[in-house]
Amino acid sequence: YDFTNCDFEKIKAAYLSTISKDLITYMSGTKSTEFNNTVSCSNRPHCLTEIQSLTFNPTAGCASLAKEMFAMKTKAALAIWCPGYSETQINATQAMKKRRKRKVTTNKCLEQVSQLQGLWRRFNRPLLKQQ
């Protein structure tokens, strides 16, 4: 999906009002210095591309974050403020339902959410280019 035509200010507002708080809640009890950020993003479409991939793609040691509150709110924000996003996600959502597993907060998941926080902060930077 090409995130170029999203309403970035509306997504930023959603992040500031709720998503950021849900990310903090998920990370509660973790020191902010515990994980090194190894990925970043260039402009807002890039940030959303990486946020969507990191949030919804299973990775080694962290099977799924998709059912977490921050992930559901991220998905809702993208569906509302990125034209055509919902249609591209139908097949992906069906596949995700098939492989849904019991939620377990592993250290790898905490590390992944720490990376997500960094990507969202970068998205939120006032000087970041729209595209």
Epitope: T38, S42, L54
Partner: antibody
Framework: QVQLQESGPGLVKPSETLSLTCTVS?????????WSWIRQPPGKGLEWIGY???????SYNPSLKSRVTISRDTSKNQFSLKLSSVTAADTAVYYC??????????WGQGTLVTVSS | EIVMTQSPATLSLSPGERATLSCRAS??????LAWYQQKPGQAPRLLIY???SRATGIPARFSGSGSGTDFTLTISSLEPEDFAVYYC??????????FGQGTKVEIK
């Protein structure tokens, strides 16, 4: 300390597909960072080709996108480049590099690929 | 596509002298700029990122400055091992990261 090593044929015929592999040691490619390909034609500057992130997102240079595929094999700690329909203009030293998706902090030593019949 | 223009193409200096390399972007890249050093037959090495932050292990004689469209890499006192080609790279314009054409610093 992370080390990267490119491997693959040094000579490719025009119209064929260039295939290179980067083997990473000292760091798991599924643990963090992005893993990128960059090329440098002889005596010229650098051109970014694309990356695959540790979580699988892929990004390509738009000027090469129609011909490029980057993939990975986490079991071997390797990532690969395929460039189709090559011409003499694709003759270059090809580097693999570690990236934070913005800039490139560790590089392989590079491998020269010549496109010629 | 953002075009990065480096000047001069070649800089002839003696060890101990100060080197000032310029990189200009065709449009603003904020501080999203990196500098690399490349010696003959070797891969590039990251020197500076975010326009002014030194990469791990890079000596203090290397410094970067600038924002927007005009950037400078300064080598305060050239060591023999600093004679090389230097490239700037912008990362403001994903997915079109671009490099400058390079500045060669040679021994006078």
């Amino acid at each position: 300390q992370v080390q990267l090593q490119e491997s693959g044929p040094g000579l490719v015929k025009p119209s064929e597909t260039l295939s290179l592999t980067c083997t990473v040691s000292g760091y798991s490619i599924s643990s963090g960072y992005g893993w990128s390909w960059i090329r440098q034609p002889p005596g010229k500057g650098l051109e970014w080709i694309g990356y695959i992130s540790y979580y699988g997102s892929i990004s390509y240079n738009p000027s090469l996108k129609s011909r490029v595929t980057i993939s990975r094999d986490t079991s071997k700690n390797q990532f690969s480049l395929k460039l189709s329909s090559v011409t003499a203009a694709d003759t270059a030293v090809y580097y693999c590099a570690r990236t934070n998706l913005l800039y490139f902090d560790s590089w392989g030593q590079g491998t020269l690929v010549t496109v010629s019949s | 596509e953002i075009v990065m223009t480096q000047s001069p193409a070649t800089l002839s200096l003696s060890p101990g002298e100060r080197a000032t390399l310029s990189c200009r972007a065709s449009q603003s890249v904020s501080n999203n700029l990196a500098w690399y050093q490349q010696k003959p037959g070797q891969a590039p090495r990251l020197l500076i990122y975010d326009a002014s932050s030194r990469a791990t292990g890079i000596p203090a004689r290397f410094s970067g400055s600038g924002s927007g469209t005009d950037f400078t890499l300064t080598i305060s006192s050239l060591e023999p091992e600093d004679f090389a080609v230097y490239y700037c790279q912008q990362y403001s314009d994903w997915p079109q990261y671009t490099f400058g054409q390079g500045t060669k610093v040679e021994i006078k």
